[in-house]
């Protein structure tokens, strides 16, 4: 009974599947199935996923497109990158603020939010590594300014003030009295 | 023993809707495409709709696509023709089918039939 | 959609002797080596039969009297010794793609 099985075609492989009655080409990313082929190893019938909404890859069976997530501007989040009839919208922080996850485990997909980047100039810092995944990281403080408790000192500007032995090493002063 | 059983013609007015039925038994209902075909009085054969095995996925000719929707039950092991806004062209003996599929080519033949249910549009 | 035409439209043949029916269609019903086309015979109200498939092959419980052949966009059905009871129509029918069609029939009567 029947033929021999077409090489071009074959029913289990990546290119065709069954679907429907045939095996049939799956369609694009960025389109979805509005019919499956109408005879062996035929094209599907697909369209163009609509505004937004996206499907990233080759599919045999998407009826529908996924909904294009929406930034979470509550979590101060903005849009990197917007969404396309192949790739959904890729979310994160604008510059100046960090992604802080909301799991432990943190991956791609974990919910997050966006917490703005600590000021090392502010805080009289050296900036040691700028804040893009985490938060800065903030070196040793700048020159005029030295080590007090947790923050940096600004030197004294006359031989008037106080300057402790940390003072005197950065400052280059001498506690007078 | 094999059997196609049909009911739910009858006489209905241009417009009007009718729900064919057709219940299947001697065979594993699930695991066969299913058809209807139709024959106009006096005329030839012409291929209605077909809905597969599996997923149900159903294909329509234009003079029906639309008007026309198959469904099937496999719990039931029934088939139904839903016919809508029908019209006097519409008249015809429709006959359920099982679908064969012969060998790794993806070919159908209709290798049983329903005894026919008269369907007739007038007013 | 594929135009599936008949010849003749009707036959008169005598009892022993051979019939052959002529089938057209308007494009290759050819796939993967496979001419995807059948044959049925309809009785006087009685549903149609299947009698061949895939152009060549009898299907199970058909007199051995009926055969197909052809490929491509040609074929024919063969009845070698006529029986009264071949008295019918005959369609042939494609699966190549839907929509599925049918040939238009050819009434076979006994001469």
């Known amino acids: 009974q029947g033929g021999t099985r077409s090489p071009r075609c074959d029913c289990a492989g990546d290119f065709h599947k069954k679907i429907g009655l045939f095996c049939c080409r799956g369609c694009p990313a960025g389109h979805y199935l509005k019919a499956p082929c109408t005879e062996p190893c035929g094209n599907s019938t697909c369209l163009v996923c609509p505004q937004d909404t996206f499907l990233a890859w080759e599919n045999h069976h998407n009826s529908e497109c996924a909904r294009c997530q929406a930034c979470d501007e509550q979590a101060s989040q903005v849009a990197l990158e917007n969404c396309s009839a192949v790739a959904d919208t890729r979310c994160g922080c604008k510059p100046g603020w960090f992604v802080e996850c909301q799991v432990s485990q943190c991956v791609s997909s974990s919910p997050f939010y966006c917490q703005p980047c600590l000021d090392c100039g502010a805080l009289h810092r050296h900036t040691r590594l700028l804040c893009s995944r985490r938060d800065t990281d903030c070196g040793t403080c700048l020159p005029g300014f030295y080590e007090h408790g947790d923050g940096c000192v600004s030197c004294p500007t006359s031989t008037l003030g106080s300057c402790p032995e940390r003072c005197a090493a950065v400052c280059g002063w001498r506690q007078m009295f | 023993q094999m059997q196609l059983v049909q009911s739910g013609g009858g006489l209905v007015k241009p417009g009007g809707s009718l729900r064919l039925s057709c219940a299947a038994s001697?065979?594993?209902?699930?695991?066969?495409?299913m058809s209807w075909i139709r024959q106009a009085p006096g005329k030839g054969l012409e291929w209605v709709s077909t809905?597969?095995?599996?997923?149900?996925?159903?294909y329509f000719p234009d003079s029906v696509k639309d008007r026309f929707t198959i469904s099937r039950d496999n719990a039931k092991n029934s088939l139904y023709l839903q016919m809508n806004s029908l019209r006097a062209e519409d008249t015809a003996v429709y006959y359920c089918t099982r679908d064969r599929i012969y060998g790794s080519v993806q070919y159908y033949a209709m290798d049983y039939w329903g005894r026919g249910t008269l369907v007739t549009v007038s007013s | 959609d594929i135009v599936m035409t008949q010849s003749p439209d009707s036959l008169a043949v005598s009892l022993g002797e051979r019939a052959t029916i002529n089938c057209r269609a308007s494009e290759s019903v050819e796939f993967s080596g496979t001419s995807l086309m059948q044959w049925y015979q309809q009785k006087p109200g009685q549903p149609p039969k299947l009698l061949i498939y895939a152009a060549s092959n009898v299907e199970s419980g058909v007199p051995d009297r009926f055969s197909g052949s052809g490929s491509g966009t040609d074929f024919t059905l063969t009845i070698s010794s006529l029986q009264a009871e071949d008295v019918a129509v005959y369609y042939c029918q494609q699966s190549r793609k839907l929509p599925y069609t049918f040939g238009q029939g050819t009434k076979l009567e006994i001469k």
């Open positions: 809905i597969s095995d599996g997923d149900s996925y159903s």
């Open positions: 001697g065979f594993t209902f699930s695991s066969y495409a």
